[in-house]
Interface confidence: medium
Amino acid sequence: IQVTQPSVVLASSRGIASFVCEYASPGKATEVRVTVLRQADSQVTEVCAATYMMGNELTFLDDSICTGTSSGNQVNLTIQGLRAMDTGLYICKVELMYPPPYYLGIGNGTQIYVIDPEPCPDSD
Amino acid sequence: IQVTQPSVVLASSRGIASFVCEYASPGKATEVRVTVLRQADSQVTEVCAATYMMGNELTFLDDSICTGTSSGNQVNLTIQGLRAMDTGLYICKVELMYPPPYYLGIGNGTQIYVIDPEPCPDSD
């Protein structure tokens, strides 16, 4: 399946980046799994993943840096706690788990840029 | 002439962005003019410009937001005072002014991303 996501997103000065991951579904999937992968220096690592039932809330693990909501074939993803060293290509992977047939789609990635804030001066 | 510059640069949290603009010269130009143009929403505006003699310092106007140094066919440009609204494509234009023949080269642009910092909390 085709997965689309923005090419570039800037994290806020608080280290929060949000983007929409949209997929074209050939049918009425009831169970969908969304995974965010990070590619940097040709290494790919899993950032977070969530499986959700269509119409229900998207729930990541409690210790996940990701949160999200779903609306139809769109998933609104938010990644928090980002620092400059986390700058990289964040790829959205969508799997239509149920009912069969199984479909897999991978986006081209969203380049997330993160700038560390200057520390505030100490208050005397 | 061919002008190369990085495709993306992040401004620091202090609103400072630096990049190198490099040009291929067919001969020994003694007088070179460098102009930084900003393209946003299909509008192109001049950010700053400086003419320099090879081997001498690159001097912008006193009220310019740009500073720079030159080394051979490389110009190291720094733009200061940037805010989020200044995010855009910054294009390096190089003119070999003297001696003839005159050559003009325009780079593909550097996308500068600027994120406004969070204000520091007031000290009580």
Partner: antibody
Framework: QVQLKESGPGLVAPSQSLSITCTVS????????LSWVRQPPGKGLEWLGV???????NFHSALISRLTISKDNSKSQVFLELNSLQTDDTATYYC???????????????????WGQGTSVTVSS | DIQMTQSPASLSVSVGETVTITCRAS??????LAWYQQKQGKSPQLLVY???NLADGVPSRFSGSGSGTQYSLKINSLQSEDFGTYFC?????????FGGGTKLEIK
């Protein structure tokens, strides 16, 4: 319209000097360069040198010691002088307007966009 | 100095055919290349500048391509008036050397 016309001596003795004048119309020598090119009988083209709008010159490295190019802007004339002629300097000599072309917003490109009809020079005793 | 190597030196073709002439520079000339046509007993005429741009009045059956050190001139559906000698010339810093030329003859 742009026109260039060369006028030369036709026959020159070996070791002597060659002087050719190029008279132009339809453009100003204060705005454009003018190149000299020669072509020996039955052979290819050889770029000799150029004089720019401000009087600056560039020469073919093999001819730098023998070649002088100058001009008189008010008369719209450019002069080529080649010293110490040998038989292999026998050629048709052309002058050509040297234009910087601009396309897109990217580059200044050069070309010899208008040529004179050429003047034939034979070096012989 | 930059050397220009042009090939082939000569070409015998029929009207209506398509021909390609190539020019190789000894170093990168950044598309600063022109093509000229010269007919017997006449002065050269500019055909293409900046490697790909047709000069004013040049028919669209002519096209230039290339970058870096490799360039070519293509003539589609040759007409009788296209026969003559073709020269390339680099204009990337003086001296502005010409290629050796390609003589296009009617078969």
């Amino acid at each position: 319209q742009v026109q260039l016309k060369e006028s030369g001596p036709g026959l020159v003795a070996p070791s002597q000097s060659l002087s050719i004048t190029c008279t132009v119309s339809g453009f100003s020598l204060t705005s454009y360069g003018l190149s000299w090119v020669r072509q020996p009988p039955g052979k290819g083209l050889e770029w000799l040198g150029v004089i720019w709008y401000d009087g600056n010159t560039n020469f073919h490295s093999a001819l730098i010691s023998r070649l002088t190019i100058s001009k008189d802007n008010s008369k719209s004339q450019v002069f080529l002088e080649l010293n110490s002629l040998q038989t292999d300097d026998t050629a048709t000599y052309y002058c050509a307007k040297t234009e910087g072309h601009y396309y897109g917003s990217n580059y200044g490109y050069y070309a010899l966009d208008y040529w004179g009809q050429g003047t034939s020079v034979t070096v012989s005793s | 100095d930059i050397q220009m190597t042009q090939s082939p030196a000569s070409l015998s073709v029929s009207v209506g055919e398509t021909v390609t002439i190539t020019c190789r520079a000894s170093e990168n000339i950044y598309s600063n290349l022109a093509w000229y046509q010269q007919k017997q007993g006449k002065s050269p005429q500019l055909l293409v500048y900046a490697a790909t741009n047709l000069a004013d009045g040049v028919p669209s059956r002519f096209s230039g391509s290339g970058s870096g050190t490799q360039y070519s001139l293509k003539i589609n559906s040759l007409q009788s008036e296209d026969f003559g000698t073709y020269f390339c010339q680099h204009l990337w810093g003086t001296p502005y050397t010409f290629g050796g030329g390609t003589k296009l003859e009617i078969k």
